[in-house]
C-alpha cells in the first residue's frame, strides 16, 4: 500500500515513515499490515487466500522383482537409477491414471531385496472447503490400485510379462501427509501483534481475515459518524466534530449540539 506525497513537505515525510515503512523518493512504501501517508494506519482486512491447490503426499514402499538389484541403483545420478526412475514413473502413471488428483511419484530410496522402492505418491486438488474429503478419497483409491497391481503383476517361472513385476507382500503405506490449510492460523499470523483482534468470517465459502474496523461483517464495529482505528489495545472509534455537533462515547453515538453548550455558557455569563 502506497501513498504519494508532492511538494516541500516530502523530505520531512521521508524520515517519518512508521511501522517499517520505507521512503522511495515520492512516498512511504508500507508493509502489508499498514497504510496511510506515513504507514500509520492498520489495515482492516488481510488477504489470506485460500491457496489455489492443496497437496497430499503418501509414503509408499513396493518391491520390484523384475529388476535385479545392483549397487549403482543407490546412486541417484547413475545411469541405472535414472533408467529405473523413468520406467517406475511410467508404470505408476499407468497404475494411477484414473485418479484426477494424481500428480506423480518421487523415488526417495532404492534398496536391496529384489528392488525395494521407497517413494512418495503426490496428489493435488483445487481448494474447496471439502478438500480433505477429496484427498482422503484419492488416497484410498491409490491404496486400492497399488494393492491390485502388486497382486496381479507378478513373476511367473522367474519371468515377468509386464512392464514391471512386484512382490505382493512388499507393498506398504507408511504415512499420509495432507498440506494443512488453516485460515484462522494464517489470519492470526499475518495480523502479527494485532492477531487477537482479527477474525475469520466466511462469504460464499471464502474466508476473510478482518478486524472489527472492516465494515459489512458480523463482527464489524459501528462507529456511526466516527472512524474505526486499530491500535495495540484493540479497535477504537475516533469521533468527529462537525460544524454543529461534538460526538463522543465508545461508538461515537453521543452527540452534543454545540449551540446548546455555547448557549449554556452564555447563560452563566
Amino acid at each position: 500500500r502506497t501513498t504519494t506525497c508532492f511538494g516541500d513537505g516530502c523530505q520531512n515525510t521521508a524520515s517519518r515513515c512508521k511501522n517499517g515503512g520505507t521512503w522511495d523518493g515520492l512516498k512511504c512504501q508500507c508493509p502489508n499490515l499498514y497504510y496511510g501517508e506515513l504507514c500509520e494506519e492498520v489495515v482492516s482486512s488481510i488477504d489470506i487466500g485460500p491457496p489455489e491447490t492443496i497437496s497430499a503426499q503418501m509414503e509408499l514402499t513396493v518391491t520390484v522383482t523384475s529388476v535385479k538389484f545392483t549397487e549403482e541403483l543407490k546412486n541417484h545420478s547413475s545411469q541405472e537409477f535414472q533408467e529405473f526412475k523413468q520406467t517406475f514413473t511410467e508404470q505408476m502413471n499407468i497404475v494411477y491414471s484414473g485418479i484426477p488428483e494424481y500428480v506423480g511419484v518421487n523415488i526417495t530410496k532404492l534398496r536391496l531385496g529384489s528392488v525395494v522402492v521407497e517413494h512418495d505418491v503426490l496428489l493435488r486438488t483445487k481448494y474447496t472447503p471439502e478438500y480433505k474429503t477429496v484427498l482422503d478419497n484419492a488416497t484410498e483409491v491409490v491404496k486400492e490400485k497399488i494393492t491390485k497391481v502388486t497382486t496381479q503383476q507378478i513373476m511367473i517361472n522367474d519371468i515377468c510379462s509386464d512392464m514391471m513385476c512386484f512382490n505382493t507382500t512388499g507393498t506398504q503405506v507408511q504415512n499420509i501427509t495432507v498440506t494443512q490449510y488453516d485460515p484462522e492460523e494464517d489470519c492470526r499470523k499475518m495480523a502479527k501483534e494485532y492477531g487477537d483482534y482479527f477474525v475469520v468470517e466466511y462469504r460464499d465459502q471464502k474466508p476473510y481475515c478482518i478486524s472489527p474496523c472492516e465494515p459489512g461483517f458480523s463482527v464489524s464495529k459501528n462507529c456511526n459518524l466516527g472512524k474505526c482505528q486499530m491500535s495495540l489495545s484493540g479497535p477504537q472509534c475516533l469521533c468527529v466534530t462537525t460544524e454543529t455537533h461534538w460526538y463522543s462515547g465508545e461508538t461515537c453515538n453521543q452527540g452534543t449540539q454545540k449551540s446548546l453548550v455555547y448557549g449554556h455558557h452564555h447563560h452563566h455569563h
Partner: nanobody, 124 residues
Framework: DVQLVESGGGVVQPGGSLRLSCAAS????????MAWFRQAPGKEREVVAF????????YYADSVKGRFTISHDNSKNTLYLQMNSLRAEDTAMYYC?????????????????WGQGTQVTVSS
C-alpha cells in the same frame, strides 16, 4: 545416450542359418541387459531371447529354444543371435534392445533402448 546398430539380416531358406549382430555404445557400466525382439507384419513385438552381460542370466522364448543362441562379447560390446534350423514363422523384423538394468521382463515397454531393426526372411 545408448546407441544400438543391428546387422546380419537377410533371406534364407527353411532349415538354414543366420547370425545377427548388435553393436552397443554409450554404456557407463559393463553390466547390463540386452535382448532380441521380433515383429512379424500385423503382429505384436515379441521377445526372442535376452542376456545379462555379466553372464548371470539368459532367457529364450519357447518357440526358439534349442534352435537360437544368444551371446555377448564384452570386449566388443556386441550382442549376437545365432539362428539355426530357421522356419517360415521366424520371418520378421528383428530388433536389438538394451537396458542399463538387469531386467527379467519380456515386455518390450520395459526396454528403453532400441535399434532400427534388421529384416530376416525365411523362404524357399
Amino acid at each position: 545416450d545408448v546407441q544400438l546398430v543391428e546387422s546380419g539380416g537377410g533371406v534364407v531358406q527353411p532349415g538354414g542359418s543366420l547370425r545377427l549382430s548388435c553393436a552397443a555404445s554409450g554404456y557407463t557400466s559393463n553390466r547390463y541387459s540386452m535382448a532380441w525382439f521380433r515383429q512379424a507384419p500385423g503382429k505384436e513385438r515379441e521377445v526372442v531371447a535376452f542376456i545379462w552381460t555379466d553372464g548371470g542370466r539368459t532367457y529364450y522364448a519357447d518357440s526358439v529354444k534349442g534352435r537360437f543362441t544368444i551371446s555377448h562379447d564384452n570386449s566388443k560390446n556386441t550382442l549376437y543371435l545365432q539362428m539355426n534350423s530357421l522356419r517360415a514363422e521366424d520371418t520378421a523384423m528383428y530388433y536389438c534392445a538394451a537396458s542399463s538394468l538387469l531386467l527379467q521382463t519380456i515386455n518390450p515397454r520395459a526396454w528403453p533402448y532400441w535399434g532400427q531393426g534388421t529384416q530376416v526372411t525365411v523362404s524357399s
